[in-house]
């Protein structure tokens, strides 16, 4: 988790001076309580935008846009804390929205956005927007939080942000597989323009069966420049096993921008349909 | 135009199942998050169950886990909810809703982060 462009954060507004500021995620308010504090955010929203650093680079950012209630509680709100929890990793990210000036009632509902969290591919997060000083131990909750799931670089939008791009999300392998006779596979892929190897995994199952019963690992070299986009094409011979008839074949690049940690395709073939054993013909006896 | 159309709805018995539909256009279907909401007679809007743009994640509500799935036909840009079991606290108006942005609102608390609804379809579980 992190901030885009640091320098550039702004929460002022017309009628407020505001200031974005590093926060530990432990206000001072949880450890030295306020009597009076300020209700909870409304109609907090978060959506996935994308937005452009300085150096051109484009990524995925939490857009966190929330409002004010019309009470009176807004004389003794300080600012908020703005957090983004990585659900898989536990890793919490804060800033805090500062005000330096006293907030007045004014003919429009108070909006605040924020569009600075870097959020990565197919990760999920809790944004949680706390009102400061924060409430009481007894007190009234007042903050707001909703879960927010990034779509992964198989998006068409996700697909051209810096981050799928550089895990080699451009490439379509479009993959082909087909069996062949005494029991092979003809495993055939698009090569990407850059010289750097690639692994075929065929991992085989029994019908209807999540367990292995065949695994397989084949390298493929470096292609040379001329052959770049082009075909390869692959022959893996399976293990002769009665019933080991479904196939995954994965291929993985070792693009330089990703290692071993690049965006890995793959294919299934099914096992056969069986066809329907005919009907007996039952005996008979001839009537003559 | 940007419109989506429930159907499948129906009087149905206990125990019963039924399966709703909800056609899509004017968007790219695919690359939204979509959702399924029901209002009971005299009630507000229950969030029902989620799925994310490529059916990788599927939330539901406690109150119907176990008993409806969501499912989505990208190319088909149609959306569905397939309901087992129906009890007489089913019946509703079923709408379909479309995500605002391109994440997925997980967890539940979302009925705000929709932009466009259908117009809804009324299921009915009695005996």
């Known amino acids: 988790l992190r901030l885009l462009d640091h320098r550039a954060l702004v929460c002022s507004q017309p009628g407020l001076n505001c200031t974005v500021k590093n926060s530990t995620c432990l206000d001072d308010s949880w450890i030295h309580p306020r009597n009076l504090t300020p209700s909870s955010p409304k109609d907090l929203q978060i959506q996935l935008h994308f937005a452009h650093t300085q150096q051109g680079d484009l990524f995925p950012v939490a857009h966190i846009e929330w409002t004010l209630q019309t009470d009176a509680s807004i004389l003794y709100l300080e600012g908020a804390e703005l957090s983004v929890l990585q659900l898989n990793t536990n890793e919490r990210l804060c800033v805090r929205f500062e005000f330096l000036s006293k907030l007045r009632h004014h003919h429009r509902r108070w909006r605040f956005t924020f569009s600075h969290f870097v959020v990565d591919p197919d990760q999920e997060y809790e944004v949680t927007v706390h009102h400061l000083p924060k409430p009481i131990p007894d007190g009234d909750p007042n903050h707001q939080s909703k879960n927010f799931l990034v779509p992964d670089c198989e998006h068409a939008r996700m697909k051209v942000t810096t981050p799928c791009m550089s895990s080699g999300s451009l490439w379509d392998p479009n993959i082909t597989v087909e069996t062949l006779e005494a029991h092979q596979l003809r495993v055939s892929f698009t090569l990407w323009n850059e010289s750097t190897h690639y692994q075929i995994l065929l991992t085989s199952f029994p019908h209807m069966e999540n367990h292995s019963c065949f695994e397989h690992m084949h390298h493929i070299p470096a292609p040379r420049p001329e052959e770049f986009h082009q075909r390869s094409n692959v022959t893996l011979t399976l293990r002769n096993l009665k019933g080991c008839c479904r196939h995954q074949v994965q291929i993985q690049p070792f693009f330089s921008s990703c290692l071993n940690d690049c965006l890995r395709h793959s294919a299934t073939v099914s096992c056969p349909e069986m066809p329907d054993t005919p009907e007996p013909i039952p005996d008979y006896m001839p009537l003559w | 135009e940007v419109q989506l159309v429930e159907s499948g709805g129906g009087l149905v018995q206990p125990g019963r199942s039924l399966r709703l539909s909800c056609a899509a256009s004017?968007?790219?279907?695919?690359?939204?998050?979509m959702h399924w909401v029901r209002q009971a007679p005299g009630k507000g809007l229950e969030w029902v169950s989620g799925?994310?743009?490529?059916?990788?994640?599927?939330d539901y509500a406690d109150s119907v886990k176990g008993r409806f799935t969501i499912s989505r036909d990208n190319a088909k840009n149609s959306l569905f909810l397939q309901m087992n079991s129906l009890r007489p606290e089913d019946t509703a108006l079923y709408f379909c809703?479309?995500?605002?942005?391109?994440?997925?609102?997980?967890?539940?608390?979302?009925?705000?982060?929709?932009?466009?609804w259908g117009q809804g379809t009324m299921v009915t579980v009695s005996s």
């Open positions: 809703a479309k995500e605002r942005s391109l994440g997925y609102c997980s967890g539940g608390t979302c009925s705000d982060a929709f932009d466009i």
């Open positions: 004017g968007f790219a279907f695919a690359d939204y998050a």
């Open positions: 799925i994310s743009w490529n059916s990788g994640r599927k």
